[in-house]
Interface confidence: medium
Amino acid sequence: AQHVTTQLVLRNKGVYESVKYIQQENFWIGPSSIDLIHLGAKFSPCIRKDQQIEQLVLRERDLERDSGCCVQNDHSGCIQTQRKDCSETLATFVKWQDDTGPPMDKSDLGQKRTSGAVCHQDPRTCEEPASSGAHIWPDDITKWPICTEQAKSNRTGFLHMDCQIKGRPCCISTKGSCEITTREYCEFMHGYFHEEATLCSQVHCLDKVCGLLPFLNPEVPDQFYRLWLS
């Protein structure tokens, strides 16, 4: 049986939309599938790599690599999207390419970045972990770390940094899929909202879905002990 909930929820474009949340109901009247997985049910994607989920994550990453920061022209906010999802008339799509990207570093003058921009994250303004010396962030946004400390400056002069961020990574469903969404939408969909991250590649949704002890390597499920727990 399915339980369907419909509600007006604030979406990425800053408008309220009618959204459906479909929950598979427990036939025996009890915890939801998400809760059962958290409690240690035998769920194979938490025990070993699942090809289908791996393909999904790789597909999400490929899309994210090509994303940019969509900044609303009315200063109402910004969100990480694909170019096709960013209005050409109402917004500005900030995407580094050709010669528009910043230099890789103050000590690497000849190479400019082509991957980015990312809403609210920039290697030039992040102090922890700083992109410098032997630890220059790669020219691939899907390999960027979470920035835990920004340079103390209220304005950077960058469109993608000085805007109000409207969406962050949200882990939705037992498949561990990730979307950049508003907090409101994420909570309605019973997802896990990552306030600390800017990109889906920075979060490991399956680790969150599985719960219990975190994976030793967040990319590799290793909860063999589930076989005995249930």
Partner: antibody, heavy 123, light 106 residues
Framework: QVTLKESGPGILQPSQTLSLTCSFS??????????VGWIRQPSGKGLEWLAH???????YYNPALQSRLTVSKDTAKNQVFLKIANVDTADTAIYYC???????????????WGTGTTVTVSS | QIVLTQSPAIMSASPGEKVTMTCSAS?????MYWYQQKPGSSPRLLIY???NLASGVPVRFSGSGSGTSYSLTISRMEAEDAATYYC?????????FGAGTKLELK
């Protein structure tokens, strides 16, 4: 409007330390992405980059002169300093400071130059 | 360090004439920068990132090139263009300048 002005001793003797000051206005070195560089030009010759300093106190020096150079800044006073130790007659030149094109924009260049200060090393 | 060789060292051109000077790098650089210096004055930025005109620079100036070979072109020489032109690389430290091309008015 961005302006920079260099000042120095004019004349000094070999083995002394040359102290130069670059006083600027129209921008702040506490602003993200700003930098100031030093370049010199011996009379009738070409330009030689010496050093530059960034808003975050990151410093870069010409390796050929590194052991003798020290660059520093006083953000509050809008000043950048260059010291050259143990000068020689070969250090006689016009010394320029220039604002490094904002690291915050995505370009690098010596955007605005000072008028230069002439330094003569003579015994 | 990257050595920049400018040629010719000295050249002259008549008003209206097209002028091209070159800058050759000892190893490949990503971008080239050009400055103009008139006697008794400070250098002035003309072109950044190989082909972008700096603010206030007349459109008769243009830059091109890649790798180790770059050039600066003035489509129609004017009297005020008589000056020394320097190329500069920001590719690696130390930052280096070419020895300059002195452009005189014929």
């Amino acid at each position: 409007q961005v302006t920079l002005k260099e000042s120095g001793p004019g004349i000094l003797q070999p083995s002394q330390t040359l102290s130069l000051t670059c006083s600027f206005s129209g921008f702040s070195l506490s602003t993200f992405g700003m930098g100031v560089g030093w370049i010199r030009q011996p009379s009738g010759k070409g330009l030689e980059w010496l050093a530059h300093i960034w808003w975050d106190d990151d410093k870069y020096y010409n390796p050929a002169l590194q052991s003798r150079l020290t660059v520093s800044k006083d953000t509050a006073k809008n000043q950048v300093f260059l010291k050259i130790a143990n000068v020689d007659t070969a250090d006689t030149a016009i010394y320029y400071c220039a604002r490094v094109g904002n690291y915050g924009s995505n370009y690098w260049y010596f955007a605005v130059w000072g008028t230069g200060t002439t330094v003569t090393v003579s015994s | 360090q990257i050595v920049l060789t400018q040629s010719p060292a000295i050249m002259s051109a008549s008003p209206g004439e097209k002028v091209t000077m070159t800058c050759s790098a000892s190893s490949s650089v990503s971008y080239m920068y050009w400055y103009q210096q008139k006697p008794g004055s400070s250098p002035r930025l003309l072109i950044y990132d190989t082909s972008n005109l700096a603010s206030g620079v007349p459109v008769r100036f243009s830059g091109s090139g890649s790798g180790t070979s770059y050039s600066l072109t003035i489509s129609r020489m004017e009297a005020e263009d008589a000056a020394t032109y320097y190329c500069q690389q920001w590719n690696s430290y130390p930052l280096t300048f070419g020895a300059g091309t002195k452009l005189e008015l014929k």
